[in-house]
């Protein structure tokens, strides 16, 4: 058993049929010595008396808010949560496996630049009685500070018969130099509590590996005389690290119709303009990627050919 | 250290091309190592990230773009000299660069060159003959060093009398290649920045 926060405790349980469970001793936070009784949740049934209560925790029915009273007055609470371990593996029931970039990916993180600011998100099908708490650091043995905000519900989607909820959090490394060469990864830890179930999820990464620039901005077209070709120009996104001559991007320019199966014109360039062939009912799209360290491409910025 | 006088160079900043070749060569070599050594811990997640130049050179600090010198977090160990030299620079661009930066890059390359050559000598003794260093990568390191044109003391190639542990050598190769790729990215950014100045 360990303390998650004040008056909230996590009991780690090996989860298998007829498992013996864990013996837990609760102590009432009071100077009083006698006349103390214990109850669980909203029940008025007295579970025991005395300053300490010993319980055998085996299942969710044994978890919950234990309260010690004296003469009708509440003295203190202890909330017990369960953390299940099945076949030596901690449960991951609360969050959905996003399977990208690999299986068992519950947390996904992205950074728009090298400033040390990043966003992580996760998915769940649970809509109520759910809380998250996020901590982060650079390295684990001698951790350096990363400050995370509160996790918030950022999107809701319908997937078949199920509703899916996306939560996200923003974090900022306390003293980040955009030009630094990372040797210690960022660690992100998410505590998830659903009703009386506790789970924790972690992710470890270098900012350089989670870079995904914003799409290029201000796409403009200029038809070339006596040709089917069009000059398309754009600018670096505002959120990208500066100076741009140091933090350079490379671009992919594509002309395509509405369907992905349609024919297309595609060209890669380090410049902020390119010449392509425009077709009727097609659109020109441009996306960006770090020129020197190939992490993710940005989303496409698009303009219609016409 | 004897710093040569910068000679004007027509056209493109001459080291940019070499640095692009360097990044390409080390990225290819790393990819080859990850494929060939698939049953060794050779991915970014699996290896320890060591920097053999730590406390010996200060490339990131010395080559920091002027725009980032206002960032407190970038100035931990900055001893910046704004005097420039080295044959990579056309004279009209000298005010945009520090001798310290180019010489620091040169020292990085020299240290990695020695490590890679020592390691290759060991890998050539491996009866499995599983992986060797790409000669192209070693040649590209040499070309960039020549373009930088700094004279410095020759570092003797390390020779080891004891029997090499090929498993450890291959893991060390992965660690070195990952670190060198990160440094090659920095070098490329620096050269691009200087080229634009």
């Amino acid at each position: 058993i360990w303390e998650l926060k004040k008056d909230v405790y996590v009991v780690e349980l090996d989860w298998y049929p007829d498992a013996p469970g864990e013996m837990v001793v609760l102590t009432c936070d009071t100077p009083e010595e006698d006349g103390i009784t214990w109850t669980l949740d909203q029940s008025s049934e007295v579970l025991g008396s005395g300053k300490t209560l010993t319980i055998q925790v085996k299942e969710f029915g044994d978890a919950g808010q234990y309260t010690c009273h004296k003469g009708g007055e509440v003295l203190s609470h202890s909330l017990l949560l369960l953390h299940k371990k099945e076949d030596g593996i901690w449960s991951t029931d609360i969050l959905k496996d996003q399977k990208e970039p690999k299986n068992k990916t519950f947390l996904r993180c992205e950074a728009k630049n090298y400033s040390g600011r990043f966003t992580c998100w996760w998915l769940t099908t649970i809509s109520t009685d759910l809380t998250f708490s996020v901590k982060s650091s650079r390295g684990s043995s001698d951790p350096q500070g990363v400050t995370c905000g509160a996790a918030t519900l950022s999107a809701e989607r319908v997937r078949g018969d199920n509703k899916e909820y996306e939560y996200s959090v923003e974090c900022q490394e306390d003293s980040a130099c955009p030009a630094a060469e990372e040797s210690l990864p960022i660690e992100v830890m998410v505590d998830a509590v659903h009703k009386l179930k506790y789970e924790n999820y972690t992710s470890s990464f270098f900012i350089r590996d989670i870079i995904k620039p914003d799409p290029p901005k201000n796409l403009q077209l200029k038809p070339l005389k006596n040709s089917r070709q069009v000059e398309v120009s754009w600018e670096y996104p505002d959120t990208w690290s500066t100076p741009h001559s140091y933090f350079s991007l490379t671009f992919c320019v594509q002309v395509q119709g509405k369907s992905k199966r349609e024919k297309k014109d595609r060209v890669f360039t380090d410049k902020t303009s390119a010449t392509v062939i425009c077709r009727k009912n097609a659109s020109i799209s441009v996306r960006a990627q770090d020129r020197y360290y190939s992490s993710s491409w940005s989303e496409w910025a698009s303009v219609p050919c016409s | 250290r004897n710093l040569p006088v910068a000679t004007p160079d027509p056209g493109m900043f001459p080291c940019l091309h070499h640095s692009q070749n360097l990044l390409r060569a080390v990225s290819n070599m790393l990819q080859k190592a990850r494929q060939t050594l698939e049953f060794y811990p050779c991915t970014s997640e699996e290896i320890d990230h060591e920097d053999i130049t730590k406390d010996k050179t200060s490339t990131v600090e010395a080559c920091l773009p002027l725009e980032l010198t206002k960032n407190e977090s970038c100035l931990n160990s900055r001893e910046t000299s704004f005097i420039t030299n080295g044959s990579c620079l056309a004279s009209r661009k000298t005010s945009f660069m520090m001798a310290l930066c180019l010489s620091s890059i040169y020292e990085d390359l020299k240290m990695y060159q020695v490590e890679f050559k020592t390691m290759n000598a060991k890998l050539l003794m491996d009866p499995k003959r599983q992986i060797f260093l790409d000669q192209n990568m070693l040649a590209v390191i040499d070309e960039l060093m020549q373009a930088l044109n700094f004279n410095s003391e020759t570092v003797p190639q390390k020779s080891s009398l004891e029997e090499p542990d090929f498993y450890k050598t291959k893991i060390k190769l992965c660690i070195l290649l990952h670190a060198f790729r990160i440094r090659a990215v920095t070098i490329d950014r620096v050269m691009s920045y200087l080229n634009a100045s």
Partner: antibody
Framework: QVQLVQSGAEVKKPGSSVKVSCKAS????????LHWVRQAPGQGQEWMGW????????EYAPKFQGRVTITADESTSTAYMELSSLRSEDTAVYYC???????????WGQGTLVTVSS | DIVMTQSPLSLPVTPGEPASISCRAS??????LHWYQQKPGQQPRLLIA???QSISGVPSRFSGSGSGTDFTLTISSLQPEDFATYYC?????????FGQGTKVEIK
Amino acid sequence: QVQLVQSGAEVKKPGSSVKVSCKASGGTFSDYYLHWVRQAPGQGQEWMGWIDPENGDTEYAPKFQGRVTITADESTSTAYMELSSLRSEDTAVYYCARNKELRYFDVWGQGTLVTVSS
Amino acid sequence: DIVMTQSPLSLPVTPGEPASISCRASQSISINLHWYQQKPGQQPRLLIAFASQSISGVPSRFSGSGSGTDFTLTISSLQPEDFATYYCQQSNSFPLTFGQGTKVEIK
């Protein structure tokens, strides 16, 4: 299986014209760009131009501009390349090639040898 | 027009050995570079697109690298069927242009 089948070899006199055909099978004809590339004996390839069979749009290499005409007949899934004012240096194998991507070629015809000789 | 220069023009190789062919562009073409193989009397066959993207059906011993002006096609271990002429082609701008070819011959 996508295939491009070209017409047979031709022998032409200098100053005349030649029209080579390229019939496509497998896949929808108008879903691909169609190019013509030539290869003179012992030489590398030379790109001549492309056509979008969907709308008839064409683009020609400046070297052949005014001398080459590329057309397409959607009903028969056939493209044509006509080269006029032939000279001896036009002796080459002419290939049609196609792709959904405009600027490179993933399927090639077997080639048509055009010999220009007096 | 962008001029593509291949080297060497002829490359004698022992079967089972690796081979590397170089292609240089007269100006920067990013990764807009494609590789083809051509055997005598046959049409070209696409091997690599956009400098390093493998093509389905092409053996994994063929790989490409490079960007800007310098590109390399590498065959990790030459098989008897790989003896042929190899061409690079740029797609950075029209007109599309090819290298003059590198003939890989049996040593």
